[in-house]
């Protein structure tokens, strides 16, 4: 007769593990009990349970409500026995000896391996600012056990680096993405991956990333030199900035205050009906927590009974 | 041949607790598996529990989490700690011993009476 068993035993903690034997022997065999043991290196041999023909299923205290035999039906000559809720601990080597009628005693040794999923963090680095060097930009991180991969999935350009820790029983991967950072990479997703035999599927998590940038500004609604005569409506200037986090804007007016009548909205100067008083240099200053820029333009209001004078219209930055 | 003699019975009161003991006669065999068995007046031959030389155990259910079943290999001897006793836990307690050589031998000790009244 041999023994049919398998060399490793694989299962993912919380789970139960199989541990098969089963005696393949002569139809006049007969298996009187089946003794299974934890091999370990320092404690030597230790009985798990033994699987008696006649007084059934014994089981060590130490493993109480932990072993069991498979479900029915059970061959006589099958030894298997669960090993409920796998936990770290139970990782290693068992033994399982047969002993047969008449044909004497059969054993044979199995490694147990306990899976431990990676449960994976994503740290977030400092902010990001246009004009940075290379930057972290997250870090993601997994224990496991064996190690997990870590990596990442984004379309942004940029390095990835790993370390790794080992524990006694598990291993620590640490990856790092660096950047640098463009106001292009703002709103674009960054994703850890982390793959593991213990994981259906790979673990995404994915960060966001944020880069902090102020445009240049520039002034907007001089274009149409008939719209800045005297006596015009809905004369406006509208200044043009982007940046993250999105900017404040405030008015000025270089020669003096702003014109009574004239509303500051926003982005937006609003002119009542124009008269020549409305002329003068006009500042944009724009702001965010990152910077801070500013467009100055100059009005000319002309009064169409003064036909010698043309609008002069004089932009700078 | 070995022989097993058994101690420890008694009356009890419904409730009690008894230790019964089993000593086996030295052999040069390892004992593989020593238990008890209950015979009450009038009815079969009952299993209770056994425990192996790894001390691995097996109890009835109808005595699991009530009775403890314990073994000294050096000396060859078992130990039944009996709590929570009932009347129907009244029977004569047998111990028995189980030797593995070209197969197995089964050998049985002569009883011990424990009575419980309510």
């Known amino acids: 007769g041999e023994l049919e068993t398998s060399d490793v035993v694989t299962v993912v903690l919380g789970q139960d593990a199989k541990l098969p034997c089963f005696y393949r022997g002569d139809p006049d065999e007969q298996v009187g009990q089946v003794a299974w043991a934890r091999v370990d290196p320092n404690e030597g041999i230790r009985e798990l349970a033994l699987l008696h023909s006649k007084y059934g299923l014994h089981v060590n205290p130490a493993y109480e409500d932990r072993v069991e035999q498979p479900p029915p039906p059970r061959d006589p000559l099958d030894g298997s026995v669960l090993l409920r809720n796998a936990v770290q601990a139970d990782e290693g080597e068992y033994e399982c000896r047969v002993s047969t009628f008449p044909a004497g005693s059969f054993q044979a040794r199995m490694r147990l391996r306990v899976l431990v999923p990676p449960l994976p963090s994503l740290n977030p680095g400092p902010p990001l600012e246009e004009g940075q060097g290379l930057t972290l930009a997250a870090s993601c991180t997994a224990e496991g056990s064996p190690a997990p991969s870590v990596t990442w999935d984004t379309e942004v350009k940029g390095t990835q680096s790993s370390r790794s820790f080992t524990h006694p029983r598990s291993a620590a991967v640490t990856s790092e993405f660096h950047l640098v950072p463009s106001r292009s990479m703002n709103g674009q997703p960054l994703t850890c991956v982390v793959s593991h035999p213990g994981l259906l599927q790979d673990r995404r998590i994915t960060h966001t990333l944020q880069v902090a940038f102020l445009a240049e500004a520039s002034v907007r609604g001089l274009e149409d030199q008939n719209l800045w005569q005297v006596g015009r409506e809905g004369a406006t200037l509208k200044c043009l900035s982007e940046g993250q986090p999105p900017p404040k804007y405030n008015w000025t007016r270089l020669d003096g205050p702003l014109p009574s009548g004239v509303r500051v909205k926003g982005d937006t100067l609003g002119f009542p009906p124009l008269t020549t008083e409305h002329s003068g240099v006009y500042v944009c200053h724009v702001s965010n927590e990152l910077s801070s820029r500013d467009s100055q333009v100059t009005v000319e209001v002309l009064d169409p009974e003064d036909p010698g004078k043309q609008v002069d219209l004089v932009s700078a930055s | 041949e070995v022989q097993l003699v058994e101690s420890g019975g008694g009356l009890v009161q419904a409730g009690g607790s008894l230790r019964l003991s089993c000593a086996a006669s030295?052999?040069?065999?390892?004992?593989?598996?020593m238990g008890w068995y209950r015979q009450a007046p009038g009815k079969q031959r009952e299993y209770v529990a056994t425990?192996?030389?790894?001390?691995?155990?097996n109890y009835a259910d109808s005595v699991r989490g009530r009775f403890t079943i314990s073994r000294d290999n050096a000396e060859d001897t078992v130990y039944l700690q009996m709590n929570s006793l009932k009347p129907e836990d009244t029977a004569v307690y047998y111990c028995?011993?189980?030797?593995?050589?070209?197969?197995?031998?089964?050998?049985w000790g002569r009883g011990t009476q424990v009575t419980v009244s309510s």
């Open positions: 028995t011993a189980e030797l593995v050589r070209r197969g197995p031998t089964t050998y």
């Open positions: 425990i192996t030389t790894g001390g691995s155990t």
């Open positions: 030295r052999s040069t065999f390892s004992l593989n598996i």
